[in-house]
Interface confidence: medium
């Protein structure tokens, strides 16, 4: 009757852990927003499982997600962005688990890009700059950035600097001379929107000058 018997009874399915997490990305493709959800247990059998979002939508009551391998995804202009939406995991018409979520509190920004480091010899410092697509956005404009850098040989010894601008100055005397450094940056919503860290930008690698023995400064 249900049409799902060949894949196990619904009663069996209810024993599984269908907990999931989601993140939203606003104006990720022009004026389109996206919402991505995935099960927290990677071993969940997702056959016949669907995700649906209802409420806090413009023009429609509910929207169905598309499935892309193990993630579920919506791209739409129809998020109201005020009020909570109900996101449910469904088998047919039966909801297995639901969460009420305000999409403005689960925003994951796009990763920063164009990270670069320029050494200023006269100032004895390094100017770190990067770009973010959010400067041009209508909604998620205000971000906090996390710049992380390490000496390449120090696998897990990252130094983090939080900033709201897209430019940072690193003093030469704070870095080891004649060393290769890796630097990367990520962003998180600040101000009205809340959410998660973006993916890291691609890493940028730079070398510090050697110490000039006569002056005690780096070359």
């Amino acid at each position: 009757e249900s049409g799902y018997a060949q894949n196990g009874d619904l009663e069996d399915a209810e024993l599984d852990d269908y907990s999931f997490s989601c993140y939203s990305q606003l104006e990720v493709n022009g004026s389109q927003h996206s919402l991505t959800c995935a099960f927290e247990d990677p071993d969940v059998n997702t056959t016949n499982l669907e995700f649906e979002i209802c409420g806090a939508l413009v023009e429609v009551k509910c929207l169905n997600f598309r499935k892309l391998q193990e993630i579920y995804f919506i791209e739409t202009k129809k998020f109201l962005l005020i009020g909570k939406s109900n996101i449910c995991v469904k088998v047919g018409e039966k909801s297995l688990t639901c969460k009420k979520i305000d999409l403005t509190t689960i925003v994951k920004p796009e990763a920063p890009f164009d990270l670069s480091v320029i050494y200023r010899e006269g100032a004895n410092d390094f100017v770190v700059t990067f770009n973010t697509s959010h400067l041009q956005k209508k909604y998620v404009k205000v971000l906090m950035h996390d710049v992380a850098y390490r000496q390449e040989k120090d696998e897990n010894k990252w130094t983090h600097v939080n900033l709201s601008s897209t430019k940072l100055t690193l003093l030469q005397r704070k870095l080891q001379p004649a060393a290769m450094y890796e630097i990367k940056v990520r962003s998180i919503p600040d101000h009205y929107f809340k959410g998660f860290w973006s993916e890291w930008s691609p890493s940028y690698y730079f070398r510090t000058p050697e110490i000039n023995n006569s002056s005690g400064e780096m070359d």
Epitope: A56, V58, L80, Y192
Partner: antibody
């Protein structure tokens, strides 16, 4: 039963302040945006202000911006409107209204009976 | 802010008549329109949302249509309890604000 009860209205002199309250019951208050709408005697409806469920989304009509402040206390299921620098043109019946976002967007599906504010010297 | 203009501002009709009220937005608002009914001394009551969806408990003689800039409320056969003032409404989500039309007063002829 879903219910909204406004209070705090009264007669006040121009330039003075007044705080309106709205007590909500019968629904999960912190799931919903809330609004204040007013109606001057013999006139139409005018939206005054709205606030999202978590107080992070707030809006005001141009006519009250900088003078009125909307806020809410989800623990007390209450909505408030702090009205400062009142003017004669603020005289109206003030309604509290619940926003039913599951209808698709800002839809005011439950209204209180209103509280009257009269600004006069 | 978007302006909403209702027409007519008032109209007289008889029981059993078919009545149409229009609401024009100064710019396109998709299908984001709602209609309310208000009787003297009472709070407004939601009739139609999403331009054409009927609120539960509202008689089926009420219907809504339209999109973009032009929206219509139709009462197919007027009943005595329908004589009231009707308002259209629209919204903007960011920044948050709501706009009402100026109202249409429906009177008994």
């Amino acid at each position: 039963e879903v219910q909204l009860v406004e209070s705090g209205g009264g007669l006040v002199q121009p330039g003075r302040s007044l705080r309106l309250s709205c007590a909500a019951s019968g629904f999960t208050f912190d799931d919903h945006a809330m609004h204040w709408v007013r109606q001057a005697p013999g006139k139409g409806l005018e939206w005054v202000s709205g606030i999202s469920w978590n107080s992070r989304g707030i809006g005001y009509a141009d006519s009250v911006k900088g003078r009125f402040t909307i806020f809410r206390d989800n623990a007390k299921n209450s909505l408030y409107l702090q009205m400062n620098s009142l003017r004669a043109e603020d005289t109206a019946l003030y309604y509290c209204a619940k926003d039913e976002y599951s209808r698709g967007y800002y839809v005011l599906d439950v209204w209180g009976q209103g509280t009257t504010v009269t600004v006069s010297s | 802010a978007i302006q909403l203009t209702q027409s007519p501002s008032s109209l007289s009709a008889s029981v059993g008549d078919r009545v149409t009220i229009t609401c024009r937005a100064s710019q396109g608002i998709s299908s984001a329109a709602a209609w309310y009914q208000q009787k003297p001394g009472k709070a407004p009551k939601l009739l139609i949302y999403d331009a054409s969806s009927l609120e539960s408990g509202v008689p089926s003689r009420f219907s809504g249509s339209g999109s973009g800039t032009d929206f219509t409320l139709t009462i197919s056969s007027l009943q005595p309890e329908d004589f009231a003032t009707y308002y259209c409404q629209q919204f903007n989500s960011y920044p948050l604000w709501i706009t009402f039309g100026q109202g249409t007063r429906l009177e008994i002829k």
